[in-house]
Every structure is written in C-alpha cells, then in structure tokens.
C-alpha cells in the first residue's frame, strides 16, 4: 500500500482552509478523549479511478467519497483519518485530513473526496473514514467503513495499467487445443513480442474430479524476433489412461518485466459426451 | 504480551448449535483482521473465515458457508464464531488467529476443541 | 478457488540433512504464501509469509522460495527439534487455503 508520488496533496475547498497529513493510523484523540465528538460519515462511496504518476505510470486508485451530516456536530469536527487496510496481507496506510478553519453549515451539504491510495491488482481492501476527533471509549462510532474490490488484470481498463502491464497482461495468446487420434493434443497459441521461453503446463483429470491422473511440462525456446506474433504449435502425448479425459492447458510466459509470476493462460479441454445408448434394436420383428 | 484465548467449545449433537468466543489481549485488536482456523483430529488445517478490522469484509470457507457466522466486538476485544447446523465433520480444534502485517498468521490461540456427535 | 498441493505428504531425514518440501498452487499467487510449522499437540507457528521472509525468531536453517505457482521450503540442517508438520498457505486472496500438510520425522 502506498500514496501516489503526486503533486502536494489538498484536501482545501471554498469555505475551508485543509491540509493532508500522514498519519500512524492512530489520532491523539483516543489518547485525549474530547467530550464533544462530531457525528460519522455519510454516503461512503469508494471507486476505481486511474491516476498518473509523475513518471508517467498509470496506477488503480481508490477514489473515496463522502459527505457530512447536516447536524451541529460539524462545529466540532477538526478533520478526518482516511484509512486504507489491505485484507490478505493486513498492511493499513492513513492520511489524515487537518481542518485549519471551522466548518460553517452552507447552502450545500460538504463533500471530500481522495484519490491517492495506489491499489493491487485483484486484491480486497477495507476503506475507513473516520471522523476526528475520535470519539470517547463509549461514544457512538463516527466512522463509515465499505469493502472494495479491485478488478483483476483481466478488466479492460486495468489492463493498461502499469502493474498488469508489468505482469503481461497485454499479450494474448489467443490459445486452440485440438484433441488428435493417438493420445495427442495439439497447442496453438500466439507469441509475444519477446524474445524469451515459455512453459505449458498440461494437467489432466478424471470426467468429474479435481485430483489430476496425468501432469507434463513441455518447455519452448525462446523464439527468435522474426517469429514474434508467430502462432506456435506444440503436439503433447497424454497418457493411455481410461477416464483421464479432461485436460487443462495453461501456458506460462517468462517475460523480463515479471520473470517467473507473469500471467498465465489456460485453455480446458473437456472430456467428450457420451451418447446415450439406445435400446437396441432386433434384427427381425416377432409376429406376436 | 499479545494473546489470544478461545471459549465455547464443548460436545453438540448433530443439527446443534455452538458460539466461539476468542478474546485478544497485548495489541491494538480494531487494528486487525482476524481469522477462525480448524483441525479435524489427525488431519491438516483448514482455515473457515476471515473478517476485516471494521467487519466491511468476511469470508467463509465453502464448506461452512450459510452455517456459520463470524463477528467481533472491537469495544470488547473479541472475536466470534457463531455455528449452527453442525455436522460431524465439524468436529476439530479451532483457532483462531491474527494476521501478520506482510502476511501470514502470527499470533494464534491455544485452541478450543468442537466435538460433534450423536 | 486455488488448491494447495504439497510434496512429499512425509519424509524421514538424519539430523543435519537438508530437507525440501515443494508446495504448489494451481494458478498463480504470486508471492502471497505463507510456511508454518505445527509440532503433536501445540498450535501452528508461522516460519515465512511473503515466500522468503523469515518470520522474527525462527532459526536462519529455514528458508523459502519461489513465486508464482511453485514454492519451496528448506530445512539447511535437519535438527531434532524440528520435527512437526509443515503446512503451506496461500493468501492472495480468498479463501486462504491450507496445503495438506508434509510430516518431518528423523531416521
């Protein structure tokens, strides 16, 4: 989890002096509990917006939205902690909002928004808005939290990001697997534009099951530059195994920008259908 | 010195209903996500659910899921698992245990043991 | 969902042997998987989360690796200590499977 490598963050609107601070995710006020606390959070929304650096990368953000209650308790509120915490790995970031000038309620209900948190890839996150000063041990929460899951690299829009780019999401092998006579498989798929080997990953199992009966690996060089963008063809010998009839192919790039974690494709090839046996019929009709 | 210590476990019989409690100490408990884990006796691991620090996030293992629900009580630095439908093959020490920042889990329960049978 | 298989179920090794256990998962996780060690009767302890980075206050004789789909753990120096069970766990996203576990024991 990181804050994009932005210009000076702001958080300063018409009719409010802010600044954004980074925080350790725990406010002095559970420290120094205040007796008046303003109300939580209204209308937490959280959108995948897309961002620049300054390098010119193009990372997901978390675009965080709120509003406030339209109640007296805005006289007391002095900011905000924005917390990010990444489900899988429980790592949290914080940034805090300082109001340097007291709110004063006007014609319009007040809106903050922050799009700053750089996030993963497929990954969940829980985002917190946490209204400051925090309230005493026993006070009603002001906090408003919402899940938000990021899109894989799969998602169009996230696919020319940097991350998944990085990862190889822009090749597409646009894989065929045939089923040949003789216990054989015919792959197809497109190389990249690298010069750089690949790996298929051949894994069969029975009609029904998720135990595989027949794994095999077959390695391909590194194609040479007049072949890229090249259809590859590789034929695979699978093992004589009655019921070992439903294959899963999945090729594995090494790309230089994501070496032995690059996304990976997988074709499913499924077993045949098996006819339903008719009643047999008699080589003569009885008379009777 | 962080801890955490389970309760409620206990002999039920099939169809039967049982609530987990795990009470954490030593840390800053409404910082973390914290997981159920259990073991079958003589089998390996299975983790049963995870929930994030302000409950916006659970998630269950398919083969508790609809029977079992998973809660916390920041206020009260705890952790529940509340089962209901229980099976047989509910039967198991569960754990429940804190994730490590970066991954894993490193502080975990001694355990409370869940027997199910008729 | 992703399944977790590891190699060997069990192994039985001499003391100052090195000792591999393979764990894989059945698509890409990058390296979002974590190695416990459970010794009879106690409860698991993490040894290394992120495929390499041992956990503070295990011995420097365990160390991981790998990324992506195929993972190793390795014990430098069989120690008698260190028989227990040893359990991989993916945690890229959930559920946040367990491998079926590899028992350790010293001939």
């Known amino acids: 989890l990181r804050l994009l490598d932005h210009r000076a963050l702001v958080c300063s609107q018409p009719g409010l002096n802010c600044t954004v601070k980074n925080s350790t995710c725990l406010d002095d006020s559970w420290i120094h509990p205040r007796n008046l606390t303003p109300s939580s959070p209204k209308d937490l929304q959280i959108q995948l917006h897309f961002a620049h650096t300054q390098q010119g990368d193009l990372f997901p953000v978390a675009h965080i939205e709120w509003t406030l209650q339209t109640d007296a308790s805005i006289l007391y509120l002095e900011g905000a902690e924005l917390s990010v915490l990444q489900l899988n790995t429980n790592e949290r970031l914080c940034v805090r909002f300082e109001f340097l000038s007291k709110l004063r309620h006007h014609h319009r209900r007040w809106r903050f928004t922050f799009s700053h948190f750089v996030v993963d890839p497929d990954q969940e996150y829980e985002v917190t808005v946490h209204h400051l000063p925090k309230p005493i041990p026993d006070g009603d929460p002001n906090h408003q939290s919402k899940n938000f899951l990021v899109p894989d690299c799969e998602h169009a829009r996230m696919k020319v990001t940097t991350p998944c780019m990085s990862s190889g999401s822009l090749w597409d092998p646009n894989i065929t697997v045939e089923t040949l006579e003789a216990h054989q498989l015919r792959v197809s798929f497109t190389l990249w534009n690298e010069s750089t080997h690949y790996q298929i990953l051949l894994t069969s199992f029975p009609h029904m099951e998720n135990h595989s009966c027949f794994e095999h690996m077959h390695h391909i060089p590194a194609p040479r530059p007049e072949e890229f963008h090249q259809r590859s063809n590789v034929t695979l010998t699978l093992r004589n195994l009655k019921g070992c009839c439903r294959h899963q192919v999945q090729i594995q790039p090494f790309f230089s920008s994501c070496l032995n974690d690059c996304l990976r494709h997988s074709a499913t090839v499924s077993c045949p259908e098996m006819p339903d046996t008719p009643e047999p019929i008699p080589d003569y009709m009885p008379l009777w | 010195e962080v801890q955490l210590v389970e309760s409620g476990g206990g002999s039920v019989q099939p169809g039967g209903s049982l609530r987990l409690s795990c009470a954490a100490s030593?840390?800053?408990?409404?910082?973390?996500?914290m997981n159920w884990v259990r073991q079958a006796p003589g089998k390996g691991l299975e983790w049963v659910s995870i929930i994030s620090s302000r409950s916006s996030i659970i998630h269950y293992a398919d083969s508790v899921k609809g029977r079992f629900t998973i809660s916390r009580d920041n206020a009260k630095n705890s952790l529940y698992l509340q089962m209901n439908s229980l099976r047989d093959e509910d039967t198991a020490v569960y754990y429940c245990?804190?994730?490590?920042?970066?991954?894993?889990?490193?502080?975990w329960g001694q355990g409370t043991t869940v027997t199910v049978s008729s | 969902d992703i399944q977790m298989t590891q190699s060997p179920s069990s192994l039985s090794a001499s003391v100052g042997d090195r000792v591999t256990i393979t764990c894989r998962a059945s698509?890409?996780?990058?390296?979002?998987l974590a190695w416990y060690q459970q010794k009879p009767g106690k409860f698991p302890e993490l040894l290394i989360y992120?495929?390499?980075t041992l956990q503070s206050g295990v011995p420097s004789r365990f160390s991981g690796s790998g990324s992506g789909t195929d993972f190793t753990l390795t014990i430098s120096s069989l120690q008698p200590e260190d028989v227990a069970t040893y359990y991989c766990q993916k945690y890229n996203r959930a559920p946040f499977t367990f491998g079926p576990g590899t028992k350790v024991d010293i001939k």
């Open positions: 245990a804190r994730p490590k920042v970066g991954g894993g889990m490193d502080v």
């Open positions: 992120a495929a390499s």
């Open positions: 030593g840390f800053t408990f409404s910082s973390y996500s």
């Open positions: 698509q890409g996780i990058s390296n979002y």
